[in-house]
């Protein structure tokens, strides 16, 4: 229960704290358990104690194995262990499990994800961040004190995140870094009654005769994925494929995209060489899910060419 | 009380067209989505269609996706589905299912109708 | 499309056996997942629906949970009745795909 795993890189800045907890005016010693050897706290030694905390300045893959601290008090002492890996440095990008700090989950709502351990070191800002070993760049990132914010999360932005940041000990300068995974919760979706965004109803759209005319459906119909929701044109209450006008084509498949977080499809109806007759026709944008239909009507109406010789 | 009731299965060859009804009643057929799901023998269930808003928005498996065609008469309550250029792997027992719009399950079926591909 | 996979693919059990059925998402579906229960020469028929919520007419003995990508259907003491497949089926994207089935048989 006492005994606490912690783990470094070589030559990077590791410090420890004793698992077991006291008042500050407690004094607290530290041992190699192995060969119950003590820790110096004098500062000029690479490895040192310093009261609850134990330092390594820097870290060697030697240093690795298992530390006794005891909190002693007038009236009691208490023994806690401090089981100490260093890893030599990775000459590739991957980040093996073993050097990983807890997984932590954000979502569109909360998506901080905090510098492990870097309250024990003494550091000022900024912290570098890093995803799968790129730096970070983009306003979507921000380093704010000791964590990192993602605007508008996505799925994409799960991942392994390394902050890096510079311990200082009397005037000398450590390097730290430190990973974890982030998942990305799907927040709960929800759907509505489709919402047709465009054309408006009863919308005149004005054409050019012998012109091409591209007519758009769009709506949305809730948050995050959605089930079984389509958009499409109908022409005088007939499918476009049944129609049998090859100049009038719907595209093909359903365009997704996010409106203020909502999920929304559009459909493009294309006219070629616009005849006379697309004007007596009835458009419809029909929106539908599981809630529902909804119907936007258009109708073409004849664009006026500019008379240049008024 | 809901009812659906599947017809016009039977022996086809590869190639062939066959074309499926559903009956339903007991509820606003309009009001639902409609799917056919297949069972091909010994196998799993697999969705092949869904159809819903009046007839108005069509959904296809990959696997039936430009030889099959689904619709509906809402007049007569009924679900269709227009199977062409048949495929021996077609061969199965096809259900139409409602679809609630809560639950997002297929709450009520029929009791199917076996389609067999064969030369 | 979302793979569902179901395990195991077939259980002997008997009559008050406590049996569970899990299902796996190939990515998170939240909880848009219903459980179906079919026997031979039938239609399927509607269990569970948005992961652990009964549908109208089921005996209390069924259950499921789970969210994300991984799902259970416990049946807390196996009746004669529910000798039978059973199946699982995500209506979070589309298509909608169902798990390869479990067949739950007399030991």
């Known amino acids: 229960k006492f005994s606490k795993q912690s783990w470094g890189l070589e030559n990077e800045a590791l410090i420890v704290r004793c698992p077991r907890q006291g008042k500050p005016s407690y004094t607290v010693d530290w041992y190699y358990s192995q060969t119950n050897k003590s820790i110096p706290t004098q500062e000029r030694n690479r490895v040192f104690a310093s009261g609850q905390l134990l330092k390594f300045l820097p870290a060697a893959v030697a240093d690795s194995g298992i530390y006794t601290c005891i909190v002693r008090s007038p009236t009691f002492n208490r023994t806690g262990y401090a089981n100490v890996t260093i890893y030599k440095k990775q000459s590739d990008c991957n980040v093996p499990d073993y050097l990983m700090y807890s997984t932590v989950s954000g979502s569109e709502k909360n998506s901080k994800i905090y510098c492990p351990t870097i309250d024990l070191y003494n550091w000022t800002a900024p912290l570098e961040w890093f995803k799968n070993c790129q730096a970070l760049q983009g306003s979507r990132y921000r380093a704010h004190k000791s964590f990192l914010v993602i605007d508008n999360v996505m799925t994409e932005d799960a991942g392994d995140y390394t902050c890096k940041f510079i311990h200082n000990e009397n005037g000398a300068n450590y390097s730290v870094t430190a990973t974890r995974s982030f998942t990305v919760k799907d927040e709960q979706g929800f759907s509505l009654f489709p919402v047709i965004g465009a054309p408006a109803q009863n919308e005149i759209k004005e054409v050019e005769i012998g012109k091409n005319a591209n007519l758009t459906c769009s709506a949305c119909f809730g948050k995050g994925t959605q089930f079984l929701a389509a958009v499409l044109w109908q022409l005088n209450g007939t499918k476009i494929t049944d129609f049998g006008e090859p100049r009038i084509q719907q595209e093909e498949g359903q365009n997704q995209s996010f409106s203020n977080g909502l999920a929304c499809l559009d459909m493009v109806l294309r006219i070629a060489d616009v005849k006379e007759e697309d004007l007596l026709l009835q458009y419809d944008c029909l929106a539908l899910n599981l809630h529902g239909l909804r119907r936007h009507t258009v109708r073409l109406s004849r664009k006026n060419p500019i008379d240049h010789h008024s | 009380e809901v009812q659906l009731l599947e017809s016009g299965g039977g022996l086809v060859k590869p190639g062939g067209s066959l074309r499926l009804s559903c009956a339903a009643s007991?509820?606003?057929?309009?009001?639902?989505?409609m799917s056919w799901v297949r069972q091909a023998p010994g196998k799993g269930l697999e969705w092949v269609s869904a159809i819903g808003g009046s007839g108005a928005g069509t959904y296809y498996a990959d696997s039936v996706k430009g030889r099959f065609t689904i619709s509906l008469d809402d007049s007569k309550n009924t679900l269709y589905l227009q199977m062409n250029s048949l495929k021996t792997e077609d061969t199965a027992v096809y259900y139409c299912?409602?679809?609630?719009?809560?639950?997002?399950?297929?709450?009520?079926w029929g009791q199917g109708t076996l389609v067999t591909v064969s030369s | 499309d979302i793979q569902m996979t179901q395990s195991p693919s077939s259980l002997s059990a008997s009559v008050g056996d406590r049996v569970t059925i899990t299902c796996r998402a190939s990515q998170s579906i939240s909880n848009w997942l219903a459980w179906y229960q079919q026997k031979p020469g039938k239609a399927p028929k509607l269990l569970i629906y948005s992961a652990s919520s009964l549908q109208n007419g089921v005996p209390s003995r069924f259950s499921g949970s789970g969210s994300g990508t991984d799902f259970t259907l416990t049946i807390s003491s196996l009746q004669p009745e529910d000798f039978a497949t059973y199946y699982c089926?995500?209506?979070?994207?589309?298509?909608?795909?169902f798990g390869q089935g479990t067949k739950v048989e007399i030991k």
């Open positions: 299912a409602r679809l609630s719009t809560v639950t997002r399950g297929f709450d009520y």
């Open positions: 089926q995500q209506s979070y994207s589309t298509p909608p795909t």
């Open positions: 007991g509820f606003t057929f309009s009001s639902y989505w």
